[in-house]
C-alpha cells in the first residue's frame, strides 16, 4: 500500500533570465527512493539515481543544474520555460510517486520598466 505523499513548491513564478529551484519532498513513507526523474511536459530533463548520481539530458545541460538535494535548478529562464514540471519518485517497495509544479516565467521588471518609461 502506498502511504507516501509528495510535497512540492506548487505554483511558482520567476523572472525571465533568472533562475528557479524546483523542489519536491516525499514524506509519510519508509520506502527507499531509488531514482527521481524530472520532466517538463513530455521531455526528460534530468535523473537522479541512488547508485549512479545525476544525469542531465544533453539538450538541457547548459541551463539545468542538479540540486539542491533531489531538486533541480533551472537557469537563464525564458518565457518558453513556462509550463508544468513533474518530479517522479521511483521507490521500493511502494512504486512511483509523482509531484507537479507549475512555473510561470514573467518578463523581468527591468524589461517592463523599460517598455513603459522611454527616455526622450
Amino acid at each position: 500500500m502506498m502511504t507516501g505523499t509528495i510535497e512540492t513548491t506548487g505554483n511558482i513564478s520567476a523572472e525571465k533570465g533568472g533562475s528557479i529551484i524546483l523542489q519536491c519532498h516525499l514524506s509519510s513513507t519508509t520506502a527507499q527512493v531509488t531514482q527521481v526523474n524530472w520532466e517538463q511536459q513530455d521531455q526528460l530533463l534530468a535523473i537522479c539515481n541512488a547508485d549512479l548520481g545525476w544525469h542531465i539530458s544533453p539538450s538541457f545541460k547548459d541551463r539545468v543544474a542538479p540540486g539542491p538535494g533531489l531538486g533541480l535548478t533551472l537557469q537563464s529562464l525564458t518565457v518558453n520555460d513556462t509550463g508544468e514540471y513533474f518530479c517522479i519518485y521511483h521507490t521500493y517497495p511502494d512504486g512511483t510517486y509523482t509531484g507537479r509544479i507549475f512555473l510561470e516565467v514573467l518578463e523581468s521588471s527591468v524589461a517592463e520598466h523599460g517598455a513603459r518609461f522611454q527616455i526622450p
Epitope: T34, Q35, E39, D42, Q43, L44, I47, N49, D51, L52, H55, S57, S59, H90, Y92, P93
Partner: antibody
C-alpha cells in the same frame, strides 16, 4: 572498457532447462539494472526480463513468466537467466544489456544462441 | 502493453541521402524512446536515448526527435557503414517493447 560476455547457450530438447550467464567487467556492476533481450532467427528484438541493481525487483515478459528466472550475483559481477520448460519458440540469440538509469541499454553482450529442438 | 509501430519496414537509399524513420507508440510514452542500430550477426548498438539524446561516440549525423506518441530518427547524410536495421524501443513501462525494425538497404 565495458564488456558483457554471455555463455550457457546450446541445443536443448523441448521441456528442458538451460542457465545463461553474463559476465560483466569494466564498470561497477552493482550500480546498474540489467536486461535480457532475445532475437529469434530472422526476427526482431524482444525484451525478456529485467533486474534492478540491488536485485530487489525483477520483471518478465508474459511469454516467459513462470518459466524463466533472472538473478544476479553482484560479488561475482554476473547476471543469470534460468530457463525452464523450454519451448521451440524460445529459440533465439539471447543478449544481456546494461541499463543506466533504468531506461536505455547502452552496452550489449555479443549474444548466446539457444536452440530448442527435438 | 504499449505497441511500437515503425515505418517503413524497409527502405533503399544511396550514400549521402537524408533518411527518416518513424516510430509511433500506441499511447503516450513521454520521451522514453530509444533507437538502436543492428548489423547482421552483431549485437544492437545504442544510437539515441530519451528521444533526442545522442549516445556518446555516435556520429552527429544521427538525430532523434519527438515526444508523446510520435518519434523520428534521422540520418542527415547516409554513410556506407549506416546500412543496417534500426529499432525503436519504449522504456516508459514494462513490458518493454520494440518496433518491428527498419532495414536500410543500398539502392
Amino acid at each position: 572498457e565495458v564488456q558483457l560476455l554471455e555463455s550457457g547457450g546450446g541445443l536443448v530438447q523441448p521441456g528442458g532447462s538451460l542457465r545463461l550467464s553474463c559476465a560483466a567487467s569494466g564498470f561497477t556492476f552493482s550500480s546498474y539494472s540489467m536486461h535480457w533481450v532475445r532475437q529469434a532467427p530472422g526476427k526482431g528484438l524482444e525484451w525478456v526480463s529485467s533486474i534492478k541493481s540491488s536485485a530487489s525487483y525483477s520483471s518478465y515478459a508474459d511469454s516467459v513468466k513462470g518459466r524463466f528466472t533472472i538473478s544476479r550475483d553482484n560479488s561475482k559481477n554476473t547476471l543469470y537467466l534460468q530457463m525452464n520448460s523450454l519451448r521451440a519458440e524460445d529459440t533465439a540469440v539471447y543478449y544481456c544489456a546494461r541499463v543506466p538509469y533504468d531506461y536505455w541499454m547502452d552496452y550489449w553482450g555479443q549474444g548466446t544462441l539457444v536452440t530448442v529442438s527435438s | 502493453d504499449i505497441q511500437m509501430t515503425q515505418s517503413p519496414s524497409s527502405l533503399s537509399a544511396s550514400v549521402g541521402d537524408r533518411v527518416t524513420i518513424t516510430c509511433r507508440a500506441s499511447q503516450s510514452i513521454s520521451s522514453y524512446l530509444n533507437w538502436y542500430q543492428q548489423k547482421p550477426g552483431k549485437a544492437p548498438k545504442l544510437l539515441i536515448y530519451a528521444a533526442s539524446s545522442l549516445q556518446s561516440g555516435v556520429p552527429s549525423r544521427f538525430s532523434g526527435s519527438g515526444s508523446g506518441t510520435d518519434f523520428t530518427l534521422t540520418i542527415s547524410s547516409l554513410q556506407p557503414e549506416d546500412f543496417a536495421t534500426y529499432y525503436c524501443q519504449q522504456s516508459y513501462s514494462t513490458p518493454l517493447t520494440f518496433g518491428g525494425g527498419t532495414k536500410v538497404e543500398i539502392k
